[in-house]
Structures are given as C-alpha cells and as structure tokens.
Amino acid sequence: DAHKSEVAHRFKDLGEENFKALVLIAFAQYLQQCPFEDHVKLVNEVTEFAKTCVADESAENCDKSLHTLFGDKLCTVATLRETYGEMADCCAKQEPERNECFLQHKDDNPNLPRLVRPEVDVMCTAFHDNEETFLKKYLYEIARRHPYFYAPELLFFAKRYKAAFTECCQAADKAACLLPKLDELRDEGKASSAKQRLKCASLQKFGERAFKAWAVARLSQRFPKAEFAEVSKLVTDLTKVHTECCHGDLLECADDRADLAKYICENQDSISSKLKECCEKPLLEKSHCIAEVENDEMPADLPSLAADFVESKDVCKNYAEAKDVFLGMFLYEYARRHPDYSVVLLLRLAKTYETTLEKCCAAADPHECYAKVFDEFKPLVEEPQNLIKQNCELFEQLGEYKFQNALLVRYTKKVPQVSTPTLVEVSRNLGKVGSKCCKHPEAKRMPCAEDYLSVVLNQLCVLHEKTPVSDRVTKCCTESLVNRRPCFSALEVDETYVPKEFNAETFTFHADICTLSEKERQIKKQTALVELVKHKPKATKEQLKAVMDDFAAFVEKCCKADDKETCFAEEGKKLVAASQAALGL
C-alpha cells in the first residue's frame, strides 16, 4: 500500500533507534572506506529529515523514494572520487541504475585493517563513557567489513553485544566474563554473514526462482506439518525480505521481517509446534529464534510420493500447465519427508525429476518413460552420504588442524591459481565442517555438512569473482548453484598448472611468530603449506608431511631459543635448503 512519504512510513514503523541503526548499516555497507564520523553525520542528517516528514508528509522531498534520498545523501560525500574511484560514476546515474551501481561496487574483501580487540578495561571505559557511540561503532565496523550482513540480524547481534558489556563490565573478572561472549559473537557473526552472503548470491546470480526453491525445501523440512499453501506464503514473504536486504533496502527489509515474524507467531498452529518459545520473545530475539528453530516432527503416515508424482495420469498435464506449482509441490512433499537430506540434495532431486518430465512428457508413452525416475535419485543420494562418511572418518583420524591441512593440499592442487590467503581461509572453513557436523548422528550429518559446505564454497566464489584467476573455479561457481560442491569435489589435480617459481622470502620466518595466538600460528603454517604445494603440485602427502613436521619443529625450537631472531635466520636457511632437497625443488 502506497504511502505519501516512504521515509516517514519506515521511521514510524521502525522507531528512531532502529531507523538510525539501519541507515548507518546501509551507508557503511555502501561506502565501506568512509570514516565513522562521516557516516554518523550523514545518518543524523537523514534522521532529522525523516522527522520533518513524519511531522508533515507533504513537506519538500518527503515523497522521494528511499533510494533517491539515500543515494543523494551518499553522493554528497566530498571524497567519493578519490576514495572510491569509479564508484563515484554511480552518482551520475538516475535511480534505479544508481542503486544497482552502488550494489555492484560492494566489496566482499575490502582493504580494511584487521579489527584488533582492545584491553577489556579500555573497552569497558569506552562503553560507559558513550554507550551510543560505542554500539554505533560496532554496527559500522561489522557492516563495512560484511557488506551483505543481514541488517535486522545485525541489530540482534548489537543487542547481545550491548548486553555482554552491560553485564561483564560490572563483573569481578571482566575479562573472564566478556571475552568468551565476544568470541562467541564474532564466530556467530562470521557464520551469519557467510550464510546471508549465499542467500544474496543465490538471488543475484541465479534469480528469485533459485532462492524460492531453496526456501521451499528448507521451510518444508522445518515445518513438515504446514500445508503447501502455507509454506508457499512463507516462501513468498521470506523471498521479499531477503530480496530487499540483498538490494540495500534495509528499512523495508527489517520492517517486512518483523511483519513476517508476527504472521508466523499468529499462525503457529498451522505452521509448527516448535514456535511457542520463540514467539514469547521480544522482536529481534523472536525473529532470530524463528530463523533457527528446530525441525518440527513429521506428520505420521505420510503417503507414498509415487502416487502423485509417478503414478497419476495427470503428472505431465500438471507439469506442463504450471511447472512452478507442480515442482514446488514435489519439492515440498520430498523435503518434509526428508529432514535427513541437505537442501542442495533435495534441489538436485527436484531438478532431476524436472529434467525427466521435460524429456518424457512429449513421448508416446510418458509414464513408461518416467516410471523409474525415483531410481535415478539413488546415486544422487549416495554421493554426499559416502563423501561425508569418508571425510568424517578422516577428520576423526586427523583432528581439525590436520584435516584442514589435508583439505588445503587437496584444494590447492585442484585450483592452484587461487590466491594463497583465499585458499587458506576457504580450506580452514571447509575443515571446520568436521567439528561442526561429524559429531551429529547420521540423520543430521548431511543437512549439516553439505549445506555448510555450500556456504563456504560461496565464499570462494564471491572472493574469486572479484579477481578471477581460474576458469575451473568460475565454471563450478556459475554453472549450477546446487552442484557447486559436487563440481569442486570432482575436480582433479590441475595438470595445466605451471608450478610457481621458488621464492625463499615466502619461507622466511621471524620471531614475531612466537607471540602469535595458536590460531594465527596455524594460519602462518598453513600459508606455507599452500605455497609449498604451489611450488611442487606433484609432491606426495608423505613429502609434504615431512616438510611440515620439520617446519613445526623449527618454529618450536626457535621460539624456545634465547636469541630467537638469529635462530630463525640461521635455522630457517637450513630448513629451506632441506625442504628444497626433500621436494626436489
């Protein structure tokens, strides 16, 4: 329904606090390099303007779209050209092209300094001195580093961040209270960002239908007692919410997400028995809780799928006349019966079913042609099952760090052109699938593992898209969203790769490695491992293990030495020489 003033409408719906927070997130996600103070100034100007529109919706410019208002504001930034280069050209465009232009310039890997956590006392003082600025800075720093972070969910993170400081800055042992909470928020935040990035990639690269198919499958698993019409309504609304957030329409997105949570809670009885606790919570917690809610129990005595989707004489007629509805029903019925399957597997099965019908329906005897379609599903189901079984066995045998290393070697050999930091980041995250999913019983392993791998491989895809270096990565990333993981799994060693020239500097280490955290030290070692494989792609596991063991011993030895720097210099030369000999470099 049309409002005279969109900005007044959203301000009233969301309230001043959420309005300001969301505008800050939006601006920080677009102009990722701008200083905090500049963004705060812009947000305050927009907020004051919104208030004038609330007072009088007919006031000048109040009828303008949010994209026009926000875009005009962003384009007032004086340093736009020198800071962002060609992004400044967006300002010469009219809406909606201008917003599309800003979206295209969002940077998944912005050149920003790593966030260093200050001492707890310093943070608590800053929190007490100016709580509002402290929390705004949190929103700003996360949003600019994660330009697709799900904005209403970031408000939830900020609320938890505030709660952590409120509680812990009064505690006897502030650090013991606060640091685990901040670690948890950081890890959950990274995971949330990556999950949302996949949703946006799905919408932007593969279209609304791809996202809707994903949503039908996931919501049908989660709400197996809900009718298809109910699931379809939720999918339509959820698609609108994510389309808005991924498109930078954060006020509309947050508003519509709140409406969706309200609807779900008002209609719990026809959706899921698991929503009761979620629906008793305040808005931000409620929305988060609904998004994470466990799968409801499957209805008893669900009939066989074959009746409607193989045996019925109307299969082809129903398919041809409304593919979206018929295939949507197939996906819904299959997914609600299979919480043990990953969403991507369910989508592969639906695609196979669709392809079979498209091939068979025009035939002389369609039923004979598609009668065995369910048999075609067996290898598709077994492939991820076997892969997960093998990799969980490997994980249990090696532990997380060495499992990550095995994946580092595997993926560097598959796509050696990819930058070392990207290979390290992606392989480390792929390796986390072990501790995340292998502890689960078989019925939960596949949805945990394969859907998590989809999220991680999407990180590889978005990072690679910024600076494409490998045709194989481009192919796996762009051909099919649901077949990305099987595509990468199927890649063998890249025989066309010309090994990297040996550079001793890459393997020169200094005493600063000794003061790093265990995680940072692992990353240093894993960076060296990737470089080794890039120099010697045909190196065997045994050769690489020997070199890495020597390297670990070298670091341990020199970190215990009195003159660490000298040790690193002298022993490092020996290590490089020994490694070159061992690998035949």
Partner: antibody, heavy 121, light 110 residues
Framework: EVQLVESGGGLVKPGGSLRLSCAAS????????INWVRQAPGKCLEWVGI???????FYATWAKGRFTISRDDSKNTLYLQMNSLKTEDTAVYYC???????????????WGQGTLVTVSS | AIQLTQSPSSLSASVGDRVTITCQSS???????LSWYQQKPGKAPKLLIY???KLTSGVPSRFSGSGSGTDFTLTISSLQPEDFATYYC???????????FGCGTKVEIK
C-alpha cells in the same frame, strides 16, 4: 527427405472455420511433439499450440476454445481446426516439431513452408 | 502478461561486423528455456540456439548465445553475407501456454 507440408489455407470470412493440414514425410509424426506457430504479415511469430506424441494438447491462452489440434496417425498428418475466425487471425501458419527430448521448451527444429490464412469480409 | 522484448528492432551492419541482439523477458524464462531463430524473407524460421547458449548442429560457431533469467544476448562475431535476416528469440515459461516469441530484429546491410 524429411519434410512437413502445410495445406488448407485460403480466404475465409470472419466467423468462419478452416482446417489446416500438416503432412509429414520421412518421419513418423506420432513419435513427435508438433506445434502450430503463426506469423501475421510483417509481424511477430506467435505460438498457437502443441500436440504431444501421446495425443495430449495444449494451447496458447488466446487460442483456447477456438482452435483444436488433432492427428491422424494412419495418414501421418496433423490438423489445426480453426473456428470463429477473426480478421486478426490472418497469418501464415506453420507446423513445426519440438526438438526431441523436450516437451514444453520453445525449441522448434523442423518447419513446414507455411500456409497463408486470410480472414476478410 | 508475459513479454519478450527484443532490441534493437532493426540494425544496419557491414560484413565482418560484430552484431549483438538482446532479448529481455518479463517474467524470467523457465530454466533457461530460451531459443534464437533466423528467418529470411518468404522462408520458415530456423533454430540457431537453444537453452540460451547451445548451438544447434550445423550452425556456424560465429553465432553465440548468452544470458540467464531475464536478459539474453545473441552475438554474431563476424557478420557474413548470408546472415542478413530477421532474428527472433523464443521463451518458455512455467506454463506451456505462455510460450512466446520476441518481435524480431532485422539485420540489414549498411
């Protein structure tokens, strides 16, 4: 040689009826999905409808109720029965096969030469 | 209503030129169900490309198709004398009854 040959076109008054034929040689029509596509003089192509090998038919929304596609397997011939004709139905009518392996996709590989239908008073 | 919009409606080009024709669909086509046809005066259309980018056998490799969802392109990398014709895109949708063609792009000699 594989070919489709349309016939039955001509001049007809508004409100009248006409039956077009599409005779096949070199292929067995009963194994194919066959479409009718029309093209008004100097205008766009327009899909009319399809008959699958099984005999199931589908029509463009505007053609439902007025146009009927049928097939006589013994004559290896396809038909388009057109009733309640309007001046805007004036066009060249083509029969065309859907690429094997597809049922609902707009991939039409073998075409006849077309037959002209003129609806005029 | 389903719309398949081709642009430009006509263009003039010389032999050897690179020619690009676009086809925009509203809503998006089903599962890349997009085809391109070539039609010469007095003749039936000829299928060049299906599934947005797959070349029909016998069609020269100078023809290529790309795109997905709503935006598609037909490219002729180096126009030959026999390529002067009208080109149509065809789209398939959720319902077979919505099968539609664009209104054509006439490629003329400059």
């Amino acid at each position: 040689e594989v070919q489709l040959v349309e016939s039955g076109g001509g001049l007809v008054k508004p409100g009248g009826s006409l039956r077009l034929s599409c005779a096949a040689s070199g292929i067995d029509l009963s194994n194919y999905a066959i479409n009718w596509v029309r093209q008004a003089p100097g205008k766009c192509l327009e899909w009319v409808g399809i008959i699958w090998a099984s005999g199931t038919t589908f029509y463009a929304t505007w053609a439902k109720g007025r146009f009927t596609i049928s097939r006589d397997d013994s004559k290896n011939t396809l038909y388009l029965q057109m009733n309640s004709l309007k001046t805007e139905d004036t066009a060249v009518y083509y029969c065309t096969t859907t690429v094997p392996g597809y049922s609902t996709a707009p991939y039409f590989d073998l075409w006849g030469q077309g037959t002209l239908v003129t609806v005029s008073s | 209503a389903i719309q398949l919009t081709q642009s430009p409606s006509s263009l003039s080009a010389s032999v050897g030129d690179r020619v690009t024709i676009t086809c925009q669909s509203s809503p998006s086509v089903w599962s890349n169900f997009l085809s391109w046809y070539q039609q010469k005066p007095g003749k039936a259309p000829k299928l060049l490309i299906y599934e947005a980018s797959k070349l029909t056998s016998g069609v020269p490799s100078r023809f290529s198709g790309s795109g997905s969802g709503t935006d598609f392109t037909l490219t002729i990398s180096s126009l030959q004398p026999e390529d002067f014709a009208t080109y149509y895109c065809g789209g398939g949708y959720s319902s077979i009854s919505d099968t539609t063609f664009g209104c054509g792009t006439k490629v003329e000699i400059k």
